[in-house]
């Protein structure tokens, strides 16, 4: 399978997740109880497959509304957790461009 054009990966993925999830933070692998199918992890989902805003939202650490699922503990950080300072240099325009591209 070849990578489709509408993918997000690398720093652009981290930037876009930071924008979409805001101060909720995000998981690098979705808690299994939050999805009907087996979670592949965001790298598998977004780096190689078409990745949209709805999919990105499922990786946010807390639901956007108040119905937080307290039965779902945060996942343990994998050993591929990024060394970059996530969100340290907030550049709204960069994230806005990425999310606009995903909406198309």
């Amino acid at each position: 399978a070849y990578r489709p054009s509408e993918t997000l990966c690398g720093g652009e993925l981290v930037d876009t997740l930071q924008f979409v999830c805001g101060d909720r933070g995000f998981y690098f692998s979705r808690p299994a109880s939050r999805v009907s199918r087996r979670s592949r992890g965001i790298v598998e989902e977004c780096c190689f497959r078409s990745c949209d805003l709805a999919l990105l939202e499922t990786y946010c650490a807390t639901p956007a509304k108040s119905e937080r699922d307290v039965s779902t503990p945060p996942t343990v950080l994998p050993d591929n957790f990024p060394r970059y300072p996530v969100g340290k240099f907030f550049q709204y325009d960069t994230w806005k461009q990425s999310t606009q591209r995903l909406r198309r």
Partner: antibody
Framework: EVQLLESGGGLVQPGGSLRLSCAAS????????MTWVRQAPGKGLEWVSS????????VYADSVKGRFTISRDNSKNTLYLQMNSLRAEDTAVYYC????????????WGQGTMVTVSS | DIQMTQSPSSLSASVGDRVTITCRAS??????LNWYQQKPGKAPKLLIY???KLEDGVPSRFSGSGTGTDFTLTIRSLQPEDFASYFC??????????FGPGTKVEIK
């Protein structure tokens, strides 16, 4: 300690085939995108191909598309590159590297394996 | 695809010199820029990541700066072991990470 060890290089005639391997240890292999990078003699570094953590998805540089196939065996912590229809311009040192998918650098490299395509 | 350019392609310098290498991206990559050193017959070695963060074990005479599209690697006081090739790499968009063409630092 993270280690990547490439093997399988050698001398092959144009049109021939080779299979490179990269044995990984010291990290959770199945969590990473794995990548092949090559360097022709006296030239710069060129990305060749990458494979998703599960092995279900692949992507290739235009220069090798249709000729090279990347694969992995997560049970053996090993990455492969099947190289067919080799050309003189494929002559290079081939390196494997791990990619977190989160914008990290390639912090560990193997020693590389030399592929020479010549008649 | 994001294209990376580097300048100069080569330079001659003496031990103790201050050396500056520049790298430019074809679009903004924020701070997702890494620098590597490579000596003949060896694999590349990570020097700096996230544009300015020094990798563990790398001497403090190496420094990096920049954000967006323009980046700089500086060697404050060139040492004999620093004569090598240097490559920049963007990791803002991956897979398909791209490298600069390299800068060869030679002895004057």
């Amino acid at each position: 300690e993270v280690q990547l060890l490439e093997s399988g290089g050698g001398l092959v005639q144009p049109g021939g085939s080779l299979r490179l391997s990269c044995a990984a240890s010291g990290f959770t292999f199945s969590a990473y995108i794995m990548t092949w990078v090559r360097q022709a003699p006296g030239k710069g570094l060129e990305w060749v191909s990458s494979i998703s953590p599960s092995g279900g998805y692949t992507v290739y540089a235009d220069s090798v598309k249709g000729r090279f196939t990347i694969s992995r065996d997560n049970s053996k912590n090993t990455l492969y590159l099947q190289m067919n229809s080799l050309r003189a311009e494929d002559t290079a040192v081939y390196y494997c590297a791990r990619d977190s998918g989160f914008g990290d650098p390639f912090d560990y490299w193997g020693q590389g394996t030399m592929v020479t395509v010549s008649s | 695809d994001i294209q990376m350019t580097q300048s100069p392609s080569s330079l001659s310098a003496s031990v103790g010199d201050r050396v500056t290498i520049t790298c430019r991206a074809s679009q903004s990559i924020r701070n997702y820029l890494n620098w590597y050193q490579q000596k003949p017959g060896k694999a590349p070695k990570l020097l700096i990541y996230a544009a300015s963060k020094l990798e563990d074990g790398v001497p403090s005479r190496f420094s990096g700066s920049g954000t967006g599209t323009d980046f700089t690697l500086t060697i404050r006081s060139l040492q004999p072991e620093d004569f090598a090739s240097y490559f920049c790499q963007q990791s803002y968009s991956s897979p398909g990470i791209t490298f600069g063409p390299g800068t060869k630092v030679e002895i004057k």
